[in-house]
């Protein structure tokens, strides 16, 4: 009699994550009597995937009715494939007995799963840095397969070169992750700047996935201070202005000191934005010269975004 053959026609099958995979298997003979089982992997550690007689395999269904008389098709369909389903699947014929005895295995079908990378997530530094300092941004994307992937960084459309990228794991895996760090030199003009992490993969339909971060979250632009005196008014009052310019973020407290004593404290709020994203603020102080015998030392003290205070002083001359 002709020897029983277990035929798995496809050496390999590739599917997209989320789709269904059909693994084909036919036998050449109905005898000897005994069940067919599907396993992933070979040897003692193999994993039972489908057994018609018993067990609960919610994602696996038989393609044709295995209980039908003279059925020789034992193909299965696995639904909602994930990268974790990748591996080699074997259709195995058993001879009925107590227990059943393994008789013949098919050659195996390798299931390969292609999975899209997750949307890249870009994170910036935990604390703000000032212009002319370098800050690091990190981009992460997960769950893709195959391993080949390209990641590029851009700042305002220009590709960055100070980049370090790793794809993990280094060896064979069902899916992979990428992590990249870009070092960005900040300038005073970067409040409106943006960094983009762009990930391209074979599973994406020509359009890379993008993650973005705004440099406004990472930068601090310290203010310039200028104290000036307006001309003396007829009522012996002098108007002194403190101009605080080109600062970011808006969080700023200004204190006037007269001869070292606090005269007034103000908080910046609802300021109009400059074209470059920075802010300007002007504060005025009226000084009654006739109330002073000596020159008055006025100090404009600015505390910006929790940083140490910056002072600018000015002396108002009191003529004898």
């Amino acid at each position: 009699e002709e020897e029983l053959q277990v035929i798995q026609p496809e050496k390999s099958v590739s599917v997209a994550a989320g789709d269904s995979a059909t693994l084909n298997c036919t036998v050449s003979s109905l005898i000897p009597v005994g069940p067919i089982q599907w396993f992933r992997g070979a040897g003692p550690g193999r994993e039972l995937i489908y057994n018609l007689k018993e067990g609960h395999f919610p994602r696996v269904t038989a393609v044709s009715d295995p209980t039908k008389r003279n059925n020789m098709d034992f193909s299965i369909r696995i639904s909602n494939i994930t990268p974790a389903d990748a591996g080699t699947y074997y259709c195995v014929k058993f001879r009925k007995g107590s227990p059943d005895v393994e008789l013949k295995s098919g050659a195996g079908t390798e299931l390969s799963v292609r999975a899209k990378p997750s949307a890249p997530v870009v994170s910036g530094p935990a604390v703000r840095a000032t212009a002319e300092h370098t800050v690091s941004f990190t981009c992460e994307s997960h769950g893709f397969s195959p391993r080949d992937i390209t990641l590029k960084w851009f700042k305002n459309g220009n590709e960055l070169s100070d980049v370090q990228t790793n794809v993990d794991p280094a060896g064979k895996s069902v899916s992979y992750s990428i992590r990249s760090t870009a070092r960005v030199l900040l300038t005073r003009r970067d409040v409106h700047s943006q960094v983009i992490c762009e990930v391209a993969h074979v599973t994406l339909q020509g359009d890379p996935l993008r993650g973005t971060a705004n440099l406004s979250e990472a930068i601090r632009v310290p203010p310039f201070l200028e104290v000036t005196q307006q001309s003396m008014r007829a009522d012996n009052q002098v108007n002194v202005t403190c101009q605080v310019t080109k600062f970011y973020p808006q969080r700023l407290q200004l204190t006037w000191l007269e001869n070292g004593n606090v005269s007034r404290t103000e908080m910046a709020s609802a300021l109009p934005e400059n074209k470059d994203g920075t802010y300007n603020w002007t504060s005025w102080l009226l000084v009654n010269v006739s109330a002073h015998r000596d020159d008055v030392k006025l100090t404009c003290q600015v505390e910006h975004d929790g940083q140490p205070a910056v002072n600018k002083s000015f002396s108002v001359k009191v003529s004898a």
């Epitope: 599917v15 390969s112 080949d148 390209t150 391209a200 074979v202 339909q205 020509g206």
Partner: antibody, heavy 116, light 109 residues
């Protein structure tokens, strides 16, 4: 699911020509589409692709001579200034459902002949 | 740009023969290689993708192997309808560009 090219004809050197690719059974907004050509008796040559969102990418030799664009149902290849070496059958094709590394649906082709 | 070198450029074989066509890439393309069959006056037809995966509806006598730079298309038992020209096509995941081999014409001996 199918694709079909149109617009191929006899054209004079230096004149423009636009070829179209009409798709049915799937959406152009879901797949990368490509243009290829084959000169008489020669092999296949890649021209360029357009991404699902409409971004075109070209083979390095194209050098601005061709422009790929699309509407909701058609993809176009604009040949800015025909040359005699552009005489070929032009094919459009769609990438496979698993990724952009292969093309599984091809049109029958449209013939462009450039001659004065 | 990546160059794809296909060999032989043509071959003569008989029905039932085992036929092997090779394709070599000028740099690694991992497994991003497809094989197409084209008959005169017709569009190419996809046979194999990802170097070794048989496209649906393609007879199992066609098989592909290889990765990196060296790839092979094998027809285990040549049938009358298999006389055609075969092309390999690469995709490079960094440049995201495609290149074809120059083709192999399989003729009747």
């Amino acid at each position: 699911q199918s694709v079909e090219e149109s617009g191929g004809r006899l054209g004079q050197p230096g004149t423009p020509l636009t070829l179209s690719c009409t798709v049915s059974g799937f959406s152009l907004s879901s797949y990368v589409m490509g243009w290829f050509r084959q000169a008489p008796g020669k092999g296949l040559e890649y021209i360029g692709i357009i991404s699902s969102s409409g971004s075109p990418y070209y083979a390095s030799w194209v050098n601005g001579r061709f422009t790929i664009s699309k509407t909701s149902t058609t993809m176009d290849l604009k040949m800015n200034s025909l040359r005699s070496e552009d005489t070929a059958t032009y094919f459009c094709a769609r990438v496979g459902p698993l990724g952009v590394d292969y093309f599984n649906i091809w049109g029958p082709g449209t013939l462009v002949t450039v001659s004065s | 740009d990546i160059q794809m070198t296909q060999s032989p450029s043509s071959l003569s074989a008989s029905v039932g023969d085992r036929v092997t066509i090779t394709c070599r890439a000028s740099q690694s393309i991992n497994s991003y290689l497809a094989w197409y069959q084209q008959k005169p006056g017709k569009a190419p037809k996809l046979l194999i993708y990802s170097a070794s995966f048989l496209y649906s509806g393609v007879p199992s006598r066609f098989s592909g192997s290889g990765s990196g730079t060296d790839f092979t298309l094998t027809i285990s038992s040549l049938q009358p309808e298999d006389f055609a020209t075969y092309y390999c096509q690469s995709w490079h995941y960094i440049s995201r560009s495609y290149t074809f081999g120059q083709g192999t014409k399989v003729e009747i001996k």
